[in-house]
Structure formats: structure tokens, C-alpha cells
């Protein structure tokens, strides 16, 4: 009954600082309303990253001023984290949550090592 | 700091009606479910009701469903309990608690008690 | 819903001693729901695990978890005086969320 995630064991952002990776889940029931979130875990402390909700067939959207976008298809949501630096390298965990219609459904993954490497900066020309 | 604090309880008469409080403080309220669950004297825990985010998903135990209404005021991080047609049943020491980010129950009340009797 | 039993009731044992808690579900329960709290007398429960073998925030390291499937377990590795208090387990993978019935470690 339990609802299972899966996502990437690694993913390398590119030198423009955005990583993306697929977050899937096996849902236990015919869930209309589901919740994504992505936290961060480092030290054993966990913060959240980005979250939204969305209506299966519709797209998910974050807030404005998130630093996540993503697309959605049945079970599958494609993640795109921006604006990340190589101090932001860690794990980040794919939490969803079977909103609606009940009964409410927890899902945590494994966790996607981000490596982040801040790009060289652009010798000087004379 | 992180907490929670429980008001409202007290000794009821059953088929009354009863609002139970509690005020968060020291985090982002509206980022996190937040539960109810209680405990009768001498007994074990029982989970009652949880609140998502926003407030429109909400989910009951069996034994309090129809009777008991959760909800939460964001703004105020404040989450509610609205009991009805109480029950001797439903006497025990009532804790909120926070669902941790991760989904266990991190962060608890110190608990508030309502006894109902005649 | 996914009933947790716990064994046994009552643990006695003596400072210094190990003591292993038992908590077995009804169906599979993913490790990853699967937490622990202490409870003393007149007090709110406390998480120690959760996700079935992690350590909450300040929980010393003489407390572990461990199991998967419908068999877990809680090994307080030497009790300490304040190790005694009632243990709760608890899934939180599935509405209704449930605990078990306590298991109650007191002084021998």
C-alpha cells in the first residue's frame, strides 16, 4: 500500500547553475489532487526547496519567485532547479503527497546528489 | 524557539460542543500539516485529524468523523479543533503536533485536556 | 488502516542494561513512515526515530531502529535512568495515521 518514489541517484547541474531530474511515483489510488515538494538534506537537516500542487492532466505551477519549475505526465513530474551554486551541491529529495481524494498518501525518495561546480570566470582580453 | 501550545480544553457535558487552539510559533506555519491527537487517562496515543498547508485537505480518524472539524488560520498560525456532539469516549489529554518535513510528528504541545461528563 | 502491534507490554530491566522494543504491522509499512517516541508521565511523546532508523534532532546514539516490511525494532543500547517512559510506534505513510499500544520500559 505503501506509495514508492523514484528518482536519479545523481545529477551534475549544468555551468549555468540549473539541474533537472524526473521524480516518479507508483500511486496506491486514482489521486486527483497531488503535492510535490523538494527538500534539501544536508547534516541531517531538511528545508524545503520549492513546492506545488497540482490537478492530474493539469500542468503544475510553482510560485512566481521559485527557483523550481516543472511539467507534469501521469505519474512522472520533470524537475528543473535554477540559480544553484556549487555551495548548493547536496541531496535533494523528491516528497510527494496524495492530496485528494482520501486516503492521504505520503511518498519520499531516496534523494538526488546534486553536484554543482561554479563556472571559471572568463579570463580578461587584452 | 519552535512550539506549540495548546487552549481550550475543559470539563463539558456530553452532546455539547467544544473549540480547541493552537498557537504555533518559531517556524513557517503554513509550510507544514499540522495534527491533532489525543490521549484518554491511562491510555496509549490515538492520531485524530491532520490540516495540509492551505487548509483544504483535511483527514479523520473513524471514531470522529462528522463530529470534529479541523482547520487552521495561516495568518494567525493558529490551528483549530471544533468538537461536537462530545462523548464520554472522547475524554483524554488532546496534543497538536507538527508533521516534520520528512512526515513524522517532530514538534509536539504540551497538550490541553477536555473531559466530558454529566 | 494498518494496526501496529508492540511487544512486549512491559520491559524491567536495569540501568546500564539493552533493551530491544518490538513493533509489527498488519500489512507492509515502507521503512520510510516508520517512526518512534518516548513518552514520560505528564509529558508530550517525543520523536526519537523516524524513517525507521533515523535519529531525530538530539536524540543520543545509544537509541537506533531498524526493520522494513511489518517487523521493526527500537534498541536503547544501555538505558540510561531517563530511558525509562512508555515507547510508541508509528506509520505515517497512510491515512489514518496509527501508533501502536505502547511499550512500557520501567525500573526491575
Known amino acids: 500500500k505503501a506509495m514508492h518514489v523514484a528518482q536519479p541517484a545523481v545529477v551534475l547541474a549544468s555551468s549555468r547553475g540549473i539541474a533537472s531530474f524526473v521524480c516518479e511515483y507508483a500511486s496506491p489510488g486514482k489521486a486527483t489532487e497531488v503535492r510535490v515538494t523538494v527538500l534539501r538534506q544536508a547534516d541531517s537537516q531538511v528545508t524545503e526547496v520549492c513546492a506545488a500542487t497540482y490537478m492530474m492532466g493539469n500542468e503544475l505551477t510553482f510560485l512566481d519567485d521559485s527557483i523550481c519549475t516543472g511539467t507534469s505526465s501521469g505519474n512522472q513530474v520533470n524537475l528543473t532547479i535554477q540559480g544553484l551554486r556549487a555551495m548548493d551541491t547536496g541531496l535533494y529529495i523528491c516528497k510527494v503527497e496524495l492530496m485528494y481524494p482520501p486516503p492521504y498518501y505520503l511518498g519520499i525518495g531516496n534523494g538526488t546528489q546534486i553536484y554543482v561546480i561554479d563556472p571559471e570566470p572568463c579570463p580578461d582580453s587584452d | 524557539q519552535v512550539q506549540l501550545v495548546e487552549s481550550g480544553g475543559g470539563v463539558v457535558q456530553p452532546g455539547r460542543s467544544l473549540r480547541l487552539s493552537c498557537a504555533a510559533s518559531?517556524?513557517?506555519?503554513?509550510?507544514?500539516?499540522v495534527h491533532w491527537v489525543r490521549q484518554a487517562p491511562g491510555k496509549g496515543l490515538e492520531w485524530v485529524s491532520v490540516?495540509?498547508?492551505?487548509?483544504?485537505?483535511?483527514f479523520y480518524a473513524d471514531s470522529v468523523k462528522g463530529r470534529f472539524t479541523i482547520s487552521r488560520d495561516n495568518s494567525k498560525n493558529t490551528l483549530y479543533l471544533q468538537m461536537n456532539s462530545l462523548r464520554a469516549e472522547d475524554t483524554a489529554v488532546y496534543f497538536c503536533?507538527?508533521?516534520?518535513?520528512?512526515?513524522?510528528?517532530?514538534?509536539w504541545g504540551r497538550g490541553t485536556m477536555v473531559t466530558v461528563s454529566s | 488502516e494498518i494496526v501496529l502491534t508492540q511487544s512486549p507490554g512491559t520491559l524491567s530491566l536495569s540501568p546500564g542494561e539493552r533493551a530491544t522494543l518490538s513493533c509489527r504491522a498488519s500489512?507492509?509499512?515502507?521503512?520510510?513512515?516508520l517512526a518512534w517516541y518516548q513518552q514520560k508521565p505528564g509529558q508530550a511523546p517525543r520523536l526519537l526515530i523516524y524513517?525507521?532508523?533515523s535519529r531525530a534532532t538530539g536524540i543520543p546514539d545509544r537509541f537506533s531502529g531498524s526493520g522494513s516490511g511489518t517487523d521493526f525494532t527500537l534498541t536503547i543500547s544501555r538505558l540510561e535512568p531517563e530511558d525509562f517512559a512508555v515507547y510508541y510506534c508509528?506509520?505515517?505513510?497512510?491515512?489514518?495515521?496509527?501508533f501502536g499500544p505502547g511499550t512500557k520500559v520501567d525500573i526491575k
Open positions: 508509528q506509520q505515517y505513510g497512510i491515512s489514518p495515521f496509527t
Open positions: 490540516i495540509l498547508y492551505d487548509g483544504n485537505n483535511k
Open positions: 524513517g525507521a532508523s
Open positions: 503536533a507538527r508533521g516534520a518535513l520528512l512526515g513524522a510528528f517532530d514538534i
Open positions: 500489512q507492509s509499512v515502507s521503512s520510510s513512515y
Open positions: 518559531g517556524f513557517t506555519f503554513s509550510s507544514y500539516g
